[in-house]
């Protein structure tokens, strides 16, 4: 019998590299059975995950999986960091693994990129 628990399919140590000034959609794949849970995004600040309020979010349905999307319109340098989605299901909170957004600022010709940026 298939489990009807809510599952959040963000892979451990997943990351995204994107330019500041580019659009980006951060997706949280959500599996549920009957009723879609309430899902939120938060950004890690040390050990605390701060809930993101007033941000553009949306749902996308694909076959047997739904995606809760956090829209970056566009990505800002300050968006660099780790994010987590969490679902409220039957009064329980299910948390995803964190996913990291590496924001690269477009360089001017006189600036040199860091080794991390060149490799990321």
């Amino acid at each position: 019998k298939e489990s009807c628990d809510v599952q959040l399919y963000i892979k451990r140590q997943s990351y995204h590299s994107i330019f500041a000034g580019d659009p980006f959609k951060l997706e949280c794949p959500v599996k549920y059975c009957a009723h879609r849970p309430q899902v939120t995004w938060c950004k890690l600040n040390g050990t605390t995950c701060v809930k993101l309020e007033g941000r553009h979010t949306s749902w996308k349905q694909e076959k047997n999986l739904s995606f809760f999307i956090l829209h970056f319109e566009p990505v800002l340098p300050s968006d660099n960091g780790s994010y987590r989605c969490s679902a409220n299901f039957l009064s329980a909170i299910i948390e995803s693994h964190s996913t990291t957004l590496y924001v690269t600022d477009v360089k001017s010709a006189s600036e040199r990129p860091s080794k991390d940026e060149m490799a990321s």
Epitope: G21, E73, K107, A109, P113, M118
Partner: antibody
């Protein structure tokens, strides 16, 4: 509706100038990286340059010194000023939102450089 | 200067076939590569960015892989609507802060139905 619309194309003589516009609707163009890409008739895509969200412009060597990308935030528009035009600049010119994740493109405007 | 070499320049395949296109950079561009689809008379459409990230709304039959200098774009099961020209583009210039004397786009691959 979120879209980009290019305009200003047309027929111009070699050595002449033309200013293309890229008008944005549904989003604030000043917050985004915007690139210009062109395509000569029957040929592949060719990068012209881009302006980043901070307002710094970057150009391909073939455009450097002849082309200038600028932005008018009050009109939510971007411009490509093209001077000293050559016959090889004949192409459809596109503007696109984003540099790596270029999710939105205009329909293009045709520039013909001919005597 | 980074040069992008795309191959083949054209290919013919049957509906349902697996189609593979390659793009080679003349020097390492990490994963800063995008793939586009363009149909006649239309603007390019982003399919893949950062070498392997599927753009929003793009069917899962499209995929990309690779890093450094060698990249691959795959259509797992060719559909009639996939008839188009496909282009790779290096966006590494945004990282290193220089523009190339060469075009960061590959030469394109025209995909036709057999």
């Amino acid at each position: 509706e979120v879209q980009l619309v290019e305009s200003g194309g047309g027929l111009v003589q070699p050595g002449g100038s033309l200013r293309l516009s890229c008008a944005a609707s549904g989003f604030d163009i000043s917050k985004y990286n915007i690139q210009w890409v062109r395509q000569a008739p029957g040929k592949g895509l060719e990068w012209v340059g881009f302006i980043n969200y901070g307002g710094s412009a970057y150009y391909a060597s073939r455009a450097k010194g002849r082309f200038t990308i600028s932005r008018d935030d009050s009109k939510n528009s971007l411009y490509l000023q093209m001077n000293s035009l050559k016959t090889e600049d004949t192409a459809v010119y596109y503007c696109a939102r984003g540099l790596s994740n270029s999710d939105l493109w205009g329909q293009g405007t045709l520039v013909t450089v001919s005597s | 200067d980074i040069q992008m070499t795309q191959s083949p320049s054209s290919l013919s395949a049957s509906v349902g076939d697996r189609v593979t296109i390659t793009c080679q950079a003349s020097q390492s561009i990490s994963s800063w590569l995008s793939w586009y689809q363009q149909k006649p008379g239309k603007a390019p459409k982003l399919l893949i960015y950062r070498a392997s990230t599927l753009a929003s709304g793009v069917p899962s039959r499209f995929s990309g892989s690779g890093s450094g200098t060698d990249f691959t774009f795959t259509i797992s099961s060719l559909q009639p609507e996939d008839i188009a020209t496909y282009y790779c583009q290096s966006t590494y210039g945004g990282v290193v802060g220089s523009t190339s004397d060469d075009n960061p786009f590959g030469g394109g691959t025209k995909v036709e139905i057999k």
